[in-house]
């Protein structure tokens, strides 16, 4: 019985299973397109098991292939607003280290008020993910409308 | 060899890997915004391995962090229809037990006819997930257009 | 220590964890609605661990339940373009063997320029997945805008 319990821990400890789900804290100042995230049980249903936050940006702690997902809903938005303020674009990418900087996922809002997507991507320990929202509209901070997360899938 | 096979069962039996993918059965009466789901190999490609259906709503059987995903396509829909019938909104949440009631995921259709999203969230044994579609438009029952699922990710 | 390392390999070798993330290579000729994919580290962040490509289509090598995800962004697109060229539709399905042919996931662009979705589905060794884009608009080949992937979830 004790042996089985020991095995049960293996995937979590040895294999990883790093996972994080974040909620929006705030947007940066006008010339900083990044969204700043927060996570932790005290904040609701957000959490970090492995990855960490560095000044509101998500930093990876374990090499592997990750499923990255995001949903962003614009505040006070209608299809008219969205098209009037076009282009509003969201991009998720590795922003540091600079040598690994790359855009991983990009979507425009066009006449919609929400974007949601996901993708598999290799990430390395120390990679910091940034989510850039360009345009003049601000995102909703409702935790069921705007969130960002990663899930370790395999080495 | 037998030992290796025993280990191979551990993640499924001990660790979980509960998973379900459901197809739409029907919508509720006018004052019930819930979508009613069904699943099982006899119905096509839907299935339940761990979670169960309780009067068309998905009930969780194992504590853990889950990836919840959904796609809903409106029937007889064009961007004109969608905007004329706005707001049409889909929300996925824990609807019982009442003490844990919360909206997990929310999207509006605006000028689109399909919404699709996913998120990581902690769920507990006994949590029942409801998917509420508010508005006058009905969802397509095509199994490749409307579906709802959960995947256990880690304890 | 060697024992723990041996266990660590089990999920990868014995249990699967097949995974692939592909980028768009090209579209087919006018009467072929299929998108042709490519993957491998030399191409950027795409990869195949288990599944293989067969003339640009993804072939599954291990039975199991998979998470299938896709994002397609139309090139040179605005909400006006998208609605003028409507209907533009993306469908992901099993296209061979013919006996298992079925549509798994379908979305229309309506007034949007990007679709993104995901679903859980059982797939069998030898299943080939095709992604059909119908309409006159072409997809973007930017690797952060158009991608397609699968992740083995459980037997």
């Amino acid at each position: 019985q004790r042996f089985a319990q020991a095995q049960q821990q293996l995937p979590l400890e040895s294999l990883g299973w790093d996972v994080a789900e974040l909620q929006l804290n705030h947007t940066g100042p006008q010339q900083d397109p990044r969204l700043y995230w927060q996570g932790g049980p005290a904040l609701g249903r957000s959490f970090l098991h492995g990855p960490e936050l560095d000044k509101g940006q998500l930093r990876i702690h374990r090499d592997g292939i990750y499923m990255v997902h995001i949903q962003v809903t614009l505040a006070i938005c209608s299809s008219t607003t969205a098209s009037r303020h076009h282009p509003t674009t969201l991009a998720v990418g590795i922003c540091s280290p600079a040598s690994r900087s790359i855009s991983l996922l990009r979507l425009s809002f066009h006449q919609g008020c929400t974007i949601a997507s996901q993708r598999l991507t290799p990430l390395a320990r120390g990679d910091t993910l940034c989510t850039n929202l360009t345009g003049t509209l601000l995102p909703s901070r409702n935790t069921d409308e705007t969130f960002f997360g990663v899930q370790w899938v395999r080495p | 060899q037998r030992f290796a096979q025993a280990q191979q069962q551990l993640p499924l039996e001990s660790l979980g890997w509960d998973v379900a993918e459901l197809q739409l059965n029907h919508t509720g009466p006018q004052q019930d915004p819930r979508l009613y789901w069904q699943g099982g190999p006899a119905l096509g490609r839907s299935f339940l391995h761990g979670p169960e259906l309780d009067k068309g709503q998905l009930r969780i059987h194992r504590d853990g962090i889950y990836m919840v995903h959904i796609q809903v396509t409106l029937a007889i829909c064009s961007s004109t229809t969608a905007s004329r019938h706005h707001p049409t909104t889909l929300a996925v949440g824990i609807c019982s037990p009442a003490s844990r009631s919360i909206s997990l995921l929310r999207l509006s259709f605006h000028q689109g006819c399909t919404i699709a999203s996913q998120r990581l969230t902690p769920l507990a044994r006994g949590d029942t997930l409801c998917t509420n579609l508010t508005g006058t438009l009905l969802p397509s029952r095509n199994t490749d257009e409307t579906f709802f699922g959960v995947q256990w990710v880690r304890p | 220590q060697r024992f723990a390392q041996a266990q660590q390999q089990l999920p990868l070798e014995s249990l699967g964890w097949d995974v692939a993330e592909l980028q768009l290579n090209h579209t087919g000729p006018q009467q072929d609605p299929r998108l042709y994919w490519q993957g491998g580290p030399a191409l950027g962040r795409s990869f195949l661990h288990g599944p293989e490509l067969d003339k640009g289509q993804l072939r599954i090598h291990r039975d199991g339940i998979y998470m299938v995800h896709i994002q397609v962004t139309l090139a040179i697109c605005s909400s006006t373009t998208a609605s003028r060229h409507h209907p533009t539709t993306l469908a992901v399905g099993i296209c061979s063997p013919a006996s298992r042919s079925i549509s798994l996931l379908r979305l229309s662009f309506h007034q949007g320029c990007t679709i993104a979705s995901q679903r859980l589905t059982p797939l069998a060794r030898g299943d080939t997945l095709c992604t059909n884009l119908t309409g006159t608009l072409l997809p973007s080949r930017n690797t952060d805008e158009t991608f397609f992937g699968v992740q083995w979830v459980r037997p």
């Epitope: 705030h26 947007t27 940066g28 100042p29 006008q30 010339q31 900083d32 700043y36 505040a75 006070i76 607003t81 303020h85 003049t136 509209l137 601000l138 909703s140 901070r141 409702n142 | - | -």
Partner: antibody, heavy 119, light 107 residues
Framework: QIQLVQSGSELKKPGASVKVSCKAS????????MNWVRQAPGQGLEWMGW????????TYADGFTGRFVFSLDTSASTAYLQISSLKAEDTAVYFC????????????WGQGTLVTVSS | DIQMTQSPSSLSASVGDRVTITCQAS??????LNWYQQKPGKAPKLLIY???RLHAGVPSRFSGSGSGTDYTFTISSLQPEDIATYFC?????????FGQGTKLEIK
């Protein structure tokens, strides 16, 4: 510490032009946008627009296009507001303002420049 | 544009009083609401941002609440140095707009 120091009061005749300066210190000038806010005598605050100090691109609110121009001298860490063809109704205190961490939240303000337009 | 309606336009209170100012937006502003204090001849000073977050160095007697279109600013115990005009500002979309101000005086 972070400071925004504006030029002194101006008395101008209708039809003339005026250029108000806002000198920034204590931070990297090109990292933060500069906003302009107008306050007519005894009135409320009106956001006029902002200038991207990295690209130089200005954004004007409705009612502040044409006669109002935002500009920069990045080497001097200074932003400018120029108003041409002055009218009596342009009489106001003009403030420059800057955000810190949060979008559209103004933590730092210049002391204000009173522009009086009178014949 | 989003209109911000502040009330009252002026009010008189005694030292130690609880003072409340309201701000109503013409549409939902998703809690992107800030409050500023302005003393005569001075620049505005940020007190509260994002509806209820207290700016660094601002005394805890100042607070904010609200959601949707309706927001409230409160001084729990009025002090002589609080005599000023207070402005709300929506920060959800351009153009940014302010309330017309509430002038606070001591009785």
């Amino acid at each position: 510490q972070i400071q925004l120091v504006q030029s002194g009061s101006e008395l101008k005749k209708p039809g003339a032009s005026v250029k108000v300066s806002c000198k920034a210190s204590g931070y990297t000038f090109t990292n933060y946008g500069m906003n302009w806010v107008r306050q007519a005598p005894g009135q409320g605050l009106e956001w006029m627009g902002w200038i991207n100090t990295y690209t130089g691109e200005p954004t004007y609110a409705d009612g502040f296009t044409g006669r109002f121009v935002f500009s920069l001298d990045t080497s001097a860490s200074t932003a400018y507001l120029q108003i041409s063809s002055l009218k009596a109704e342009d009489t106001a205190v003009y403030f420059c303002a800057r955000e810190e961490d949060y979008r559209y939240v103004f933590n730092y303000w210049g002391q204000g420049t009173l522009v009086t337009v009178s014949s | 544009d989003i209109q911000m309606t502040q009330s009252p336009s002026s009010l008189s209170a005694s030292v130690g009083d609880r003072v409340t100012i309201t701000c109503q937006a013409s549409q939902d502003i998703s809690n992107y609401l800030n409050w500023y204090q302005q003393k005569p001849g001075k620049a505005p000073k940020l007190l509260i941002y994002d509806t209820s977050r207290l700016h660094a160095g601002v005394p805890s007697r100042f607070s904010g609440s609200g959601s949707g279109t309706d927001y409230t600013f409160t001084i729990s115990s009025l002090q002589p140095e609080d005599i000023a005009t207070y402005f709300c500002q929506q920060g959800v979309t351009l153009p940014l707009t302010f309330g017309q101000g509430t002038k606070l005086e001591i009785k």
